[in-house]
Interface confidence: low
Amino acid sequence: NQDLPVIKCVLINHKNNDSSVGKSSSYPMVSESPEDLGCALRPQSAGTVYEAATVEVDVSASITLQVLVDTPGNISCLWVFKHSSLNCQPHFDVQNRGVVSMVILKMTETQAGEYLLFIQSEATNYTIVFTVSIRNTLLFTLRRPYFRKMENQDALVCISESVPEPIVEWVLCDSQGESCKEESPAVVKKEEKVLHELFGTDIRCCARNELGRECTRLFTIDLNQTPQTTLPQLFLKVGEPLWIRCKAVHVNHGFGLTWELENKALEEGSYFEMSTYSTNRTMIRILFAFVSSVARNDTGYYTCSSSKHPSQSALVTIVEKGFINATNSSEDYEIDQYEEFCFSVRFKAYPQIRCTWTFSRKAFPCEQKALDDGYSVSKFCNHKHQPGEYIFHAENGDAQFTKMFTLNIRRKPQVLAEASASQASCSSDGYPLPSWTWKKCSDKSPNCTEDIPEGVWNRKANRKVFGQWVSSSTLNMSEAMKGFLVKCCAYNSLGTSCETILLNSPGPFPFIQDS
């Protein structure tokens, strides 16, 4: 086919000297010689689709996927990976070929998958598919840690079945809430698998290797704390181990703790107790309830009772498969230019999600915070008042979730004007979307107040730029108008902006900015 572009797909392997994550780039770092990936047309596919040879990458290796396009004129492009759009900046090499690159630094499991590159040239549109897999995927894993009781000892072992062998650490904190954040001075870390000091307020175990870091918190009911307004809920998948700790402090040792599941005492061997005196001579008791591998019938209300404290419960829910619960309906916001505002997604999920916020093909880090009601929230405030579409994407191995937001910024129109031999066009991205007027400037009307009633064609919101609507108005020129100045004005509830255009000028020639 004569119209098909001549394209070449190559792989460039890099020496590892960087620690950031995959990104699109037009200037990859200095590297080894490129390896041809032999892009071939995919038969029987809708549209023009090229497929590159599958790329196998070692964990932590860095590579560049590159496409060289021999096609006349400009090209525009878009990378898409796992439903997220990534920035794409084509440039031209010395042979005037279009060059598009995707750099993947420090390859991890999350960066494996299908990378789609959409290219639009003046002649045609086409798609290039790269499949990137991790070499020895089966050998490299990072699993969330879980707890086991140490044989014949009152101690917990933290286990993470991961390859390469992970570094396991206990993260301990004796404060409440915010002061137990990872880098707080109240937090103590112990790089060991076994923990004997099980009386602390907040106990987590974390495992890390080349693939990242995963943590598990020891679920705790504290009978000395005021119960939450909503019942605490613990989710587990069938086969996972269950650990719940009940903790109580009293002035002396004269009290006991018991666990019940749905008003029935737990079986012998499903719990163990520890006690100690604190520095002020009060007695601390903890009672663990545990099930080495949960089944559906382990679901229910687990209640910890004390002879000296009000009892408290937690709802344990055993699920077959992980989930992400949230409302996925799109939400539209409109705010003033300097108003403080954050997007927010409230969700309930198990296992914990990994998430990203995306705007204008750029991914932003995603933080999540647990709420008291069992839900979590992720907020995004770094929009810098840029209007458009924002995407929240979350996944946890079992489920995926995407939510769209649109941000409109209230502002008066700003007009861009251009003229051709037969027409003059003005466009504006003000919000609310502006209305248009055209005026003629003449000897009779030096202030450009004479209306142009005919030949005007308005298009509202016909073009979306990253979700941002644009309004435009076009004036078709009559012979009688040539050589005249005309003025297009866009107005909305926040103001008016105008541009003056000389008709029949050789090129775009807006020359008076008039507000």
């Epitope: 309906s329 939400e331 539209d332 916001y333 409109e334 209230r410 609310p432 509830s493």
Partner: nanobody
Framework: EVQLLESGGGLVQPGGSLTLSCAAS????????MGWFRQAPGKEREFVAA????????YYADSVKGRFTISRDNSKNTLYLQMNSLRAEDTAVYYC??????????????????WGQGTLVTVSS
């Protein structure tokens, strides 16, 4: 607290028209995104139409697009729903709703902060 009071409901023949009004008690009416929802007997409450606080954006359920028009008069603190070409399946209690924050567009019930009492629209011959 915003109080919302709907009016304009009643019995109308298929193909007929009706205009619902929703009067808001608060002067800050203009800073809320407003919407209409409806609930037919034995069914869940569903979104009908919404309009952003500036009037810059309107939203319609597919089932009413082209037949219903939402508008607002911020000077009168009033929201309107002009319903044309009414069908039997439009029979429901129609509720006026105000956005959960001053900015969110009300297209789903979780983000509604204030509800009206509802006005009954019956389409029948």
């Amino acid at each position: 607290e915003v109080q919302l009071l709907e009016s304009g409901g009643g019995l109308v023949q298929p193909g007929g028209s009706l205009t619902l009004s929703c009067a808001a008690s608060e002067r800050t009416f203009s800073s809320y995104t407003m919407g209409w929802f409806r609930q037919a007997p034995g069914k869940e409450r569903e979104f009908v139409a919404a309009m952003s606080w500036s009037g810059g954006s309107t939203y319609y359920a597919d089932s009413v697009k082209g037949r219903f028009t939402i508008s607002r008069d911020n000077s009168k603190n009033t929201l309107y729903l002009q319903m044309n070409s009414l069908r039997a399946e439009d029979t429901a209690v129609y509720y006026c709703a105000a956005g959960g924050s001053t900015r969110v567009v009300v297209t789903t019930t979780p983000v509604v902060k204030y509800w009206g009492q509802g006005t009954l629209v019956t389409v029948s011959s």
